[in-house]
């Protein structure tokens, strides 16, 4: 039902859903700190613009009695319960920040009259694509998929002279929320990735993955998986790997690869790591001193959600426009605003754009090195290292099908 919004007469409220089920197991206190830091910045920006208004956040906590798995599995109903709570209390703000689980976001979007914008730190799944009033501030699965297809097709680089059309995808069901939806998108038979590939098989058992590494009859040399190096080691150990195997390790929210003292372990030599361009910076910020890299990205997305709201509020107020309108609800897209860590660009569908980085392990230095970058905004790959010191023969990525090209 339609809920009146606390969003006029110089007082603008943000409803922040503090859900027990979350994309990342982050103490809610850290998210509160991020939101509060964002509010301070927004107030300063509005003041600078000569806008004498009040901006506050209301934190809506679920009771945690029923929905207490802590991960996203029971988030569908929790999101709706929180919305019901808001409705009963007549305390809807100008914007809703919070649902990070794909299940909860999808259901909330489906079951409510969304005349207000929703900002999510997460909601990675394809089912949350192309939602008119939803903004996602962490890279969704669609962006990953477009990179992979772009990279598979690339055949004009010194280190990649073959187009690929095949892949294995390792997905065993124990993944983190981001990985679950990234791999889910690759698995889906109707997805862009599946449409563009000639062969794709999902490996669900550890043994299946381990067997492929030396199987002479494998149908592809390329295996996509999601997680960190430790996850790969647990699975692969020190097993021998055929020389033309390429493992693509998707580990977007982990900037540890860029730290000066990091040495790549030997088991990473057949691996290309896909991650995001590092922020190199949040270690000293007040809300993130004690956070792991992934959780820094999560808290940062909350903070940036507040800054995005401030950005849009400022524009609308300067133009003398009403905030409680469909126009405002649909405006959180196709723009760049100043985030906490620098400019943040949202695409036509309100999804954050970023620079993805593909790393390889140098056989000379045992360091991670940047092979190429990919700008999700323009769907374009930019080679960085034209003469990589690969483990693969002739310092070129092998063909994806055994028996063709360098072995």
């Amino acid at each position: 039902s339609q809920v009146s919004q606390n969003c006029h007469n110089g007082s603008y409220e943000i409803s922040v859903l503090m859900m027990g089920n979350s994309a990342f197991a982050e103490p809610l206190k850290n998210l509160e700190d991020a939101v509060n830091e964002g509010l301070e910045i927004v107030r300063g920006r509005l003041q600078n613009a000569g806008l004498n208004v009040t901006v506050n956040a209301t934190f809506m906590y679920s009771d945690g009695l029923i929905h207490n798995s802590g991960d996203c599995r029971s988030s569908t109903c929790e999101g709706l319960d929180l919305l019901r709570k808001i409705s009963n209390a007549q305390r809807m703000g100008c914007v809703l920040i919070g649902p990070s689980c794909t299940y909860s976001t999808f259901q909330m979007y489906l079951d409510t009259e969304l005349s207000y914008p929703m900002i999510s730190a997460g909601s990675f799944g394809l089912s949350c694509d192309y939602k008119e009033t939803l903004t996602r501030l962490m890279s969704p699965a669609r962006k990953l998929m477009y990179f992979l297809v772009n990279f598979w097709k690339t055949n004009d680089l010194p280190f990649k002279t073959y187009s690929w059309s095949t892949s294995y995808v390792y997905k065993n069901g124990t993944e983190t929320e981001d990985c679950f939806w990234y791999l889910n998108a690759l698995e889906a038979s109707v997805s862009y990735f599946s449409h563009e590939l000639g062969f794709k098989v999902v490996l669900r058992q550890d043994k299946e993955f381990q067997d492929i590494l030396m199987d002479h009859n494998r149908k592809s040399n390329v295996i996509i998986m999601c997680g960190g190096p430790e996850f790969l080691y647990k699975l692969k150990g020190d097993r021998a790997v055929a020389e033309d195997i390429v493992i693509i390790l998707v580990d977007l929210f982990n900037d540890q690869y860029f730290e000066d003292n990091v040495t790549a372990p030997d088991y990473m030599k057949n691996v290309l790591v896909l991650t995001l361009s590092p922020g190199n910076s949040l270690l000293n910020s007040s809300f993130s001193r004690n956070l792991s890299p992934t959780k820094r990205d999560f808290a940062l997305a909350y903070l940036n959600g507040i800054l995005l709201f401030g950005h849009m509020l400022k524009i609308f107020l300067e133009n003398g426009e009403n905030i409680t309108t469909p126009k405002f609800a649909h405006a959180f897209r196709n723009l760049t605003f100043e985030g906490y860590d620098g400019p943040v660009t949202l695409d036509d569908w309100g999804d954050v754009d970023s620079t993805m980085v593909l790393l390889y392990t140098s056989v000379d230095t045992k360091k991670y090195k940047v092979l190429l970058t990919y700008d999700t905004h323009v769907n374009k790959t930019y080679p960085v290292d034209m003469s990589p010191t690969f483990t693969w023969k002739n310092s070129k990525l092998p063909n994806d099908i055994t028996g063709r090209g360098p072995q």
Partner: nanobody, 119 residues
Amino acid sequence: EVQLVESGGGLVQPGGSLRLSCAASSNIFRAYGMGWYRQAPGKQREMVAAIWLSGRTEYADAVQGRFTVSRDNAKNTVYLQMNSLKPEDTAVYYCNAGPPTATSVRQYWGQGTQVTVSS
């Protein structure tokens, strides 16, 4: 009121160093990333370096590895350490909120500080 006061410029030989300072009013400093800009005679003003609220830094290709931007939150001051200076670094240097902040923020500029690199 927005106030930006740059200092530290001067005449220096090629290969030399300078450290520029910019004292900003707290309402700007605490709300935005800060950028250093420069304008050479007859040229457009260009951004040289930026430091965002988180402390993350960015540099123009021409100064990467030679210039370092930093901020002191207690003093509302942003610095630009310039090493290995070249004649083409000669310009008036300004500080202000970094892009892509609304242009309304950057309508106020300080007087700048002149940097001349010459033997």
